[in-house]
């Protein structure tokens, strides 16, 4: 039970177009050392949404930046949601490696559905 768990509490989240969507993720441990990444979809064709270590993700804000919640919280908020953002999002923990980090554990995924913007 001491082994790290990647917790994504919501199985599904629904948000109106134009709003921001918060996708929640937390770790139960800081070990092993390594970055967190968020992907949409699974397998070889998955799309990188956020990389804690590097990159520019203008629509993504980490929730811990907003709330200063804690260093085990890796929730993200995606702004200005459109129907194209629908899909299943995975929070993935990587173990620090050389030369490349190695995928260690994934959350169960959160399915994001997009509602029409309220009139």
């Amino acid at each position: 039970e001491d082994e790290l768990q990647v917790i994504q509490p919501e199985k599904s989240v629904s948000v109106a177009a134009g709003e921001s969507a918060t996708l929640r993720c937390a770790m139960t441990s800081l070990i092993p050392v390594g970055p967190i990444m968020w992907f949409r979809g699974a397998g070889a064709g998955r799309e990188l949404i956020y990389n804690q270590k590097e990159g520019h993700f203008p629509r993504v804000t980490t929730v811990s930046e907003l709330t200063k919640r804690n260093n085990l919280d890796f929730s993200i908020s995606i702004s200005n949601i459109t129907p194209a953002d629908a899909g299943t999002y995975y929070c993935v923990k990587f173990r620090k490696g050389s030369p490349d980090d190695v995928e260690f554990k994934s959350g169960a995924g959160t399915e994001l559905s997009v509602r029409a913007k309220p009139s």
């Epitope: 509490p9 921001s20 937390a26 919640r69």
Partner: antibody
Framework: QVQLVQSGAEVKKPGASVKVSCKAS????????MHWVRQAPGQGLEWMGI????????SYAQKFQGRVTMTRDTSTSTVYMELSSLRSEDTAVYYC??????????????WGQGTLVTVSS | DIQMTQSPSSVSASVGDRVTITCRAS??????LAWYQQKPGKAPKLLIY???SLQSGVPSRFSGSGSGTDFTLTISSLQPEDFATYYC?????????FGGGTKVEIK
């Protein structure tokens, strides 16, 4: 101080809908998730779903999917829970409850006073 | 869904007694567990979060322990105001399920 004030008791007929409101005060409304939990007479607590008042995103328990709608009005710091197609088994006290900011886990730290919804023909 | 099983469903005790309530999760939830106290006609009140952390303002006679699937709430010396129903709740996965409750009654 942090307070959640809910609307008053309701009596509804089977098949009708009910909309319960919960007005928050004493904290930044958009920074804290809000849960809805119900309790049938003499029974335990049942989690219904959650809304993020910041972006308006919602997540519902499978049991209530398609029957429940949670919304918010940031101008009045109020969240709403609407339950449709009411049946007698929906007779319960409905609570809104704020999720606090904790270092490990997502826990409810403040509860509304509850709203009794009675479904009877 | 994660099932939460509480035992016993009720316990009769006297003022000053030590009372222990257990909660078992159907799968591992690390330490992501809360305990609530509810008195008749009132909303629940958070006592313990993260399995063992005491919520601000809660008397130190309440304590929690456990990790993984097995958890315990202990009241070290029962006071008259502690007669109530206690619920555990997992905070890992929606739906955030509660245990069935344990009613602490006066012997």
């Amino acid at each position: 101080q942090v307070q959640l004030v809910q609307s008053g008791a309701e009596v509804k007929k089977p098949g009708a809908s009910v909309k319960v409101s919960c007005k928050a005060s004493g904290y930044t409304f958009t920074s804290y998730y809000m849960h809805w939990v119900r309790q049938a007479p003499g029974q335990g607590l049942e989690w219904m779903g959650i809304i993020n008042p910041g972006g308006g995103s919602t997540s519902y328990a499978q049991k209530f999917q398609g029957r429940v709608t949670m919304t918010r009005d940031t101008s009045t710091s109020t969240v709403y829970m609407e339950l449709s197609s009411l049946r007698s088994e929906d007779t319960a006290v409905y609570y809104c409850a704020r999720e606090g900011l904790y270092s490990s886990g997502w826990y409810i730290d403040v509860w509304g006073q509850g709203t009794l919804v009675t479904v009877s023909s | 869904d994660i099932q939460m099983t509480q035992s016993p469903s009720s316990v009769s005790a006297s003022v000053g007694d030590r009372v222990t309530i257990t909660c078992r999760a159907s799968q591992g939830i690390s330490s992501w567990l809360a305990w609530y106290q509810q008195k008749p006609g009132k909303a629940p009140k958070l006592l313990i979060y993260a399995a063992s952390s005491l919520q601000s303002g809660v008397p130190s006679r309440f304590s929690g322990s456990g990790s993984g699937t097995d958890f315990t709430l202990t009241i070290s010396s029962l006071q008259p105001e502690d007669f109530a129903t206690y619920y555990c709740q997992q905070a890992v996965s929606h739906p955030f399920t509660f245990g069935g409750g344990t009613k602490v009654e006066i012997k």
